[in-house]
Amino acid sequence: KNNVPRLKLSYKEMLESNNVITFNGLANSSSYHTFLLDEERSRLYVGAKDHIFSFDLVNIKDFQKIVWPVSYTRRDECKWAGKDILKECANFIKVLKAYNQTHLYACGTGAFHPICTYIEIGHHPEDNIFKLENSHFENGRGKSPYDPKLLTASLLIDGELYSGTAADFMGRDFAIFRTLGHHHPIRTEQHDSRWLNDPKFISAHLISESDNPEDDKVYFFFRENAIDGEHSGKATHARIGQICKNDFGGHRSLVNKWTTFLKARLICSVPGPNGIDTHFDELQDVFLMNFKDPKNPVVYGVFTTSSNIFKGSAVCMYSMSDVRRVFLGPYAHRDGPNYQWVPYQGRVPYPRPGTCPSKTFGGFDSTKDLPDDVITFARSHPAMYNPVFPMNNRPIVIKTDVNYQFTQIVVDRVDAEDGQYDVMFIGTDVGTVLKVVSIPKETWYDLEEVLLEEMTVFREPTAISAMELSTKQQQLYIGSTAGVAQLPLHRCDIYGKACAECCLARDPYCAWDGSACSRYFPTAKRATRAQDIRNGDPLTHCSD
């Protein structure tokens, strides 16, 4: 019932109303896919083909750029290996992370020879420094893929880089790595499809488990081929994987391999009329909404269907308590390749595989000290039996009757007159952004979704591949192959010139101030502010 947006704005309308600023790319670049938002410096760093950009958050028309191509020799070698000179034999930036107060760490495909370096950004924004450390290049293997078509998820914390990527030229050896730092690289098990089975990595996040930093975990979100016997026929499953930050590998069979890696399936489905659920299995993007308690962010996931016949998209929400419950549940087990997966019923060794070595949960100091039976069990039981179900057991947004699919999501928590609301900005594969508000009904997790706006942000239809939201600037930044776009989070004046129209819009950012539909600020002591997000009832709120 809420499938029709309150506002539908074409690219032309967005331009004419000054609601979009676009950087249409450089002639010798493309693939503006890798975003790093720095609210403190008021910069958006963007990794692209042969370039890294530093955009001003106020106006992306104001930018600096670093040109980082590959040598002619490297490009020729790539061409001789049978690769496409334009689409593959260049340096596509795949990793762009804050390294410390003064430097970024960047990695690119390097024309099928991954390479990394540091970028100096200075101590203060006013330093206006943005330059490549030309003297310090590093091997990018296990950090960036060789192939620009492959997805990478990375996270840099305490000088260590966690990456989910392909570590070989052919793009077959997928792994979750930890590199940089002073330790030997650590990775997931090789040649074992039970650990990873042709994964497509989406994102990586550090989430605390307790007040003790020893318990911190890194969570990877990815999709992968379902393991034989887990599903009849070839299927994709969405996954959440966990690794302890203080995992330094085991001994014997897991030397320099993760000992705490576990993964679970993320379910995002709707019941079908015939009793068979329709699954949205192709995880496309993830956003973590941190609010109040950093240990328990709400996970927003964007999913699409695997089927070519039935095309659909959905957004599902997950709670970290549900995720942790699954990781504390039964492990998936099978006795041989032709057997079904069952919950493991035997004795689970102590300390329980997947537990971080710390004073909180166990009496052992390092993963290198784990007993043999723990190592053996961990190696052969990386998957959990139970999946993680979404909050309320169903998606909060579903789109099945449209000619596009969801690709990206960012979420903003907005204070309104009648409470707090999560506003989702959903990117699509045709270059549009949907602005959707979740409105709680009886309980906060039983939600109604209202489609507020549908905006076309690029001149030509192009898949949105990156999105960042600046709460400070109240702006949204969008990346695609073609370029970068910037738009405000709200366009209150466009809702109309009357109180009723403003109220009916149900946009948490907007309220009637007595004379116009304008930005709502909860701190403003204005008795005339009219807004009703929960019910959108103008009769009660618009007395005039």
């Epitope: 790539c78 020879h113 296990g142 070989d168 030229f169 499809s193 069979s253």
Partner: antibody
Amino acid sequence: EVQLLESGGGLVQPGGSLRLSCAASGFTFDSYEMNWVRQAPGKGLEWVSGISWNSGWIDYADSVKGRFTISRDNSKNTLYLQMNSLRAEDTAVYYCARSGYSSSWFDPDFDYWGQGTLVTVSS
Amino acid sequence: QSVLTQPPSVSGAPGQRVTISCTGSSSNIGAGYDVHWYQQLPGTAPKLLIYGNSNRPSGVPDRFSGSKSGTSASLAITGLQAEDEADYYCQSYAGPNPYVVFGGGTKLTVLG
């Protein structure tokens, strides 16, 4: 001390079959990936086949694909190579080798080798 | 023909320094993969001599050293001794087909 001992080689006619075995000792066999590498008389080394610790990954060189089958029995600490439809060009010393993965990038090396068993394919 | 190219033979007098080259391509050594070296003494099985481009397993004398640059690698032997006379093979990951590749081997002859 790590030891790998191959057996099962011998003279066989073209089109015939042989089964090689490699008995491992001195290390935790079920922790390691294992391989067969061959060396034709007077020639260089050629990787033939590899198998992961739990047999979840198996791979072959194109020259033997469809004819050779690698397997392992972890309870017996033994690696096998079943060779069918043998050809004259399969004549070689067959070595059993353990993957060490000693380097930083986990690129396979062969840190221990058996003494080899000679397979001769001739009519 | 081997995927990795090595000179068929090298020679040197005792005490001298010799190097053996190993040239690959952008899909093996040039892809950033590690190179390993093996020594095969006459009538024996190969033995791991250098792993990960430049590391020596315990028991290998420091007269043996390895290096890698671009699509090539090299093995250097200093203070050549009579017992170094052997065949030397380089090896790299290629994945997945074939999984690993070897050089054609280099016969080292110690003169005199």
